[in-house]
């Protein structure tokens, strides 16, 4: 396989990979080969190696299709889990409530000493980056409760004891904001590294796929909306009524301050809390129990619906008006999203023309505010922050490529939701 290096990418089977990115290769005629791990190295070379399986200490190990190595039955998901706890489906595998598992390829900016640990909690899959301890042995082994391999004899090491905080921000800040690319990846069949990183995400409209840094946090959440019960939400054994908000308490993570869940009739919707890049004060402080730093002695006045202060700030970050215009004719939709900025004083108009779900035309125009005032068909829809707009434009670049070659029904609507700033829980930015 010929490998080319372009900036910080590796090319493998006509697909680009970032430095440090890992995947299972798709090899004819086998399909996805889970027993081979490939990694994009610093010099742009793809290094693939066979997975070494640890010895299993049981009489009849079980082979699971999406895992390379056989496992002992006692490390498999419990079958007799209580019916009340919702299971999770991820990558074609069902996990029981409370179960921990490892995922590949979720974080583009994962460091070599980090792995992706996921847990199933009340039907939702939560994944975070775990920094693994330095290994002092030649043949580390896998343990059921952690994505990190450990030296024999350290088997009891739980991931809270690793030398790295699960929420440590990787040094590589290049992928700081991303409207997660995988939401728009083509289906895994025939795709190099074919793990569809969020399988079924298009049917789970609530999926949150933003790995934006929030006070040093990287969390990936997949929300599974398939299960419905009653008019309440149950999380971690607690019952919440419609409209109530809470920070999830996860076995693998503890209380996750930078994720806010809200009970929406019967389903919990969890969102990353975004911290501002800039604060109106010089020395914002980190306070225990809060996700983002706060300005001492300053409290933003809440306006109905969105938490802006009187200067148009949202959680310390300046906001800008977002306008929208949607025009439909003969099965063709022209959608325009416009952001008005003060510095420079201009309006950036993003124009999408979609016919039968296929993107026909996408372009961006920068016009003066004066010119924009001549356009009465634009309606103010929200205010957003520069960091949210950055996520929007990155996601837009990804889906503009993808939706020009295949049908996209909801992608743009989902992407526009990124611009809406949710009313933050009192005191939590």
């Amino acid at each position: 396989e010929q490998v080319k290096h372009s900036e910080t990418y590796c090319m493998f089977q006509d697909k680009k990979y970032r430095v440090g990115e890992r995947w299972h290769p798709y090899l004819e005629p086998y399909g996805l080969v889970y027993c081979v791990n490939c990694i994009c190295s610093e010099n742009g070379n793809v290094l693939c190696s066979r997975v070494r399986c640890p010895n299993v200490h049981c009489l009849s190990p079980v082979h699971i299709p999406h895992l390379c190595c056989p496992r002992c039955p006692d490390s498999l998901p419990p079958v007799n889990n209580k019916v009340t706890s919702k299971s999770c489906e991820y990558n074609g595998t069902t996990y029981q409530h409370g179960e921990l598992f490892v995922a590949e390829g979720l974080f583009q900016n994962r460091q070599p000493n980090q792995c992706t640990q996921c847990s199933c909690s009340e039907g939702n899959v939560y994944c975070g980056l775990k920094t693994c301890p330095k290994l002092t042995c030649a043949f580390p082994v896998s343990v059921p409760d952690s994505c990190c391999r450990v030296c024999r004899g350290d088997g009891e090491l739980s991931w809270e004891h690793s030398d790295g905080d699960i929420f440590r921000q990787p040094a590589n800040r290049e992928a700081r904001h991303s409207y997660h690319r995988s939401h728009y990846d083509p289906p895994p069949s025939r795709q190099a590294g074919g793990l569809s990183r969020f399988p079924g995400a298009r049917s789970h409209r609530g999926a949150l796929m933003d790995s934006q840094q929030a006070s040093g946090t990287i969390v990936q959440i997949v929300i599974n909306n398939k299960h419905k019960h009653g008019q309440v939400c149950v999380s971690n054994g607690k019952t919440y009524s419609h409209g109530e908000s809470w920070h999830p308490n996860l076995r693998a993570f503890g209380i996750v301050e930078c994720v806010l869940c809200t009970c929406n009739v019967t389903k919990q919707e969890c969102k990353k809390i975004h911290c501002p890049n800039r604060y109106p004060c010089k020395y914002p402080q980190k306070i225990d129990g809060k996700c983002c730093k706060v300005c001492p002695g300053k409290k933003a006045k809440e306006l109905p619906g969105q938490s802006f202060d009187n200067k148009g700030y949202f959680c310390g970050e300046e906001t800008m008006p977002v306008y929208e215009s949607v025009f439909m004719e003969d099965g063709e939709t022209t959608r325009k999203i416009a952001l008005e900025t003060e510095r420079p004083p201009q309006v950036e108009v993003h124009v999408w023309t979609i016919r039968k779900g296929i993107l026909q035309h996408f372009h961006i125009e920068k016009i003066s505010k004066r010119m924009f005032e001549e356009l009465p068909h634009f309606k103010l829809v929200t205010r957003t922050t520069l960091s949210q707009w950055k996520i929007f434009t990155e996601g837009e670049a990804q889906i503009s490529q993808m939706c020009s070659s295949r049908v996209c029904r909801t992608e743009l609507e989902d992407l526009v939701k990124v611009l809406y700033l949710e009313r933050s829980e009192k005191g939590h930015c």
Epitope: S325, F327, E329, T334, K336, P344, P345, Q346, V349, V351, T353, H361, H363, E365, K366, I367, S368, R370, M371, F372, E374, L375, H377
Partner: antibody, heavy 122, light 107 residues
């Protein structure tokens, strides 16, 4: 190849009428705002009129010098742009260019036609 | 309406020289300025928009400078095909207006 070709120019008497046409090819005509720009003999360029796309409600704008006398229109199905000129004056004598806007709204002109000459004289 | 004033009206230069044409707006138009070239008997064509962005296919010897009310078009190492008329135009609002033009002629 992106092209604009004007027609309909000619000699007309003051207070007379003339309709200029412009056929567009090589691009998705309906997505662009379109303009007419003119140039009197030996003089500079003067913007005449603009029509936006259907998604902008075909909004029209005119230079003060032609307001209430000229009408800009378009037929997206035929990729045609028109300029109906009524109550013509001698100062309307010029080369008329059909011009494409750089986008929906940007207001600079990235494609120009070859022009059609309008002469208003008795 | 915004008035655009171009100078000089005529400019004589030789092949290989560097020339600068200036354009002044009657009010702040930020960077909403375009430059066009028109050769004798031909249609104008776009050189620069947004004050400094070169249009597709325009040689790099052309460059646009300025913002606010003062703008310039600089042509490095003049080529024979560069002689003709040059116009600035604001695209800040409606109506878009043009400068009076600069005729660049061979010395």
């Amino acid at each position: 190849e992106v092209q604009l070709v004007e027609s309909g120019g000619g000699l007309v008497q003051p207070k007379g009428s003339l309709k200029l046409s412009c056929v567009a090819s090589g691009f998705t005509f309906k997505t662009y705002a379109m303009h007419w720009v003119r140039q009197a003999p030996g003089k500079g360029l003067e913007w005449v009129a603009r029509i936006r796309s259907k998604s902008s409600n075909y909004a029209t704008y005119y230079a003060d010098s032609v307001k209430d006398r000229f009408t800009i229109s378009r037929d997206d199905s035929q990729s045609m742009l028109y300029l109906q000129m009524n109550n013509l004056k001698t100062e309307d004598t010029a080369m008329y260019y059909c011009v494409r806007d750089g986008g929906y709204y940007v207001g600079y002109f990235d494609v120009w036609g070859t022009g059609t000459t309008v002469t208003v004289s008795s | 309406d915004i008035q655009m004033t171009q100078s000089p009206a005529t400019l004589s230069a030789s092949v290989g020289e560097t020339v600068t044409i200036t354009c002044r707006a009657s009010e702040n138009i930020y960077s909403y300025l375009a430059w066009y070239q028109q050769k004798q008997g031909k249609s104008p064509h776009l050189l620069v928009y947004n004050a400094k962005t070169l249009a597709e296919g325009v040689p790099s010897r052309f460059s646009g400078i300025g913002s606010g009310t003062q703008f310039s078009l600089k042509i490095n190492s003049l080529q024979p095909e560069d002689f003709g008329s040059y116009y600035c135009q604001h695209h800040y609002d409606t109506p878009p207006t043009f400068g009076g033009g600069t005729n660049l002629e061979i010395k």
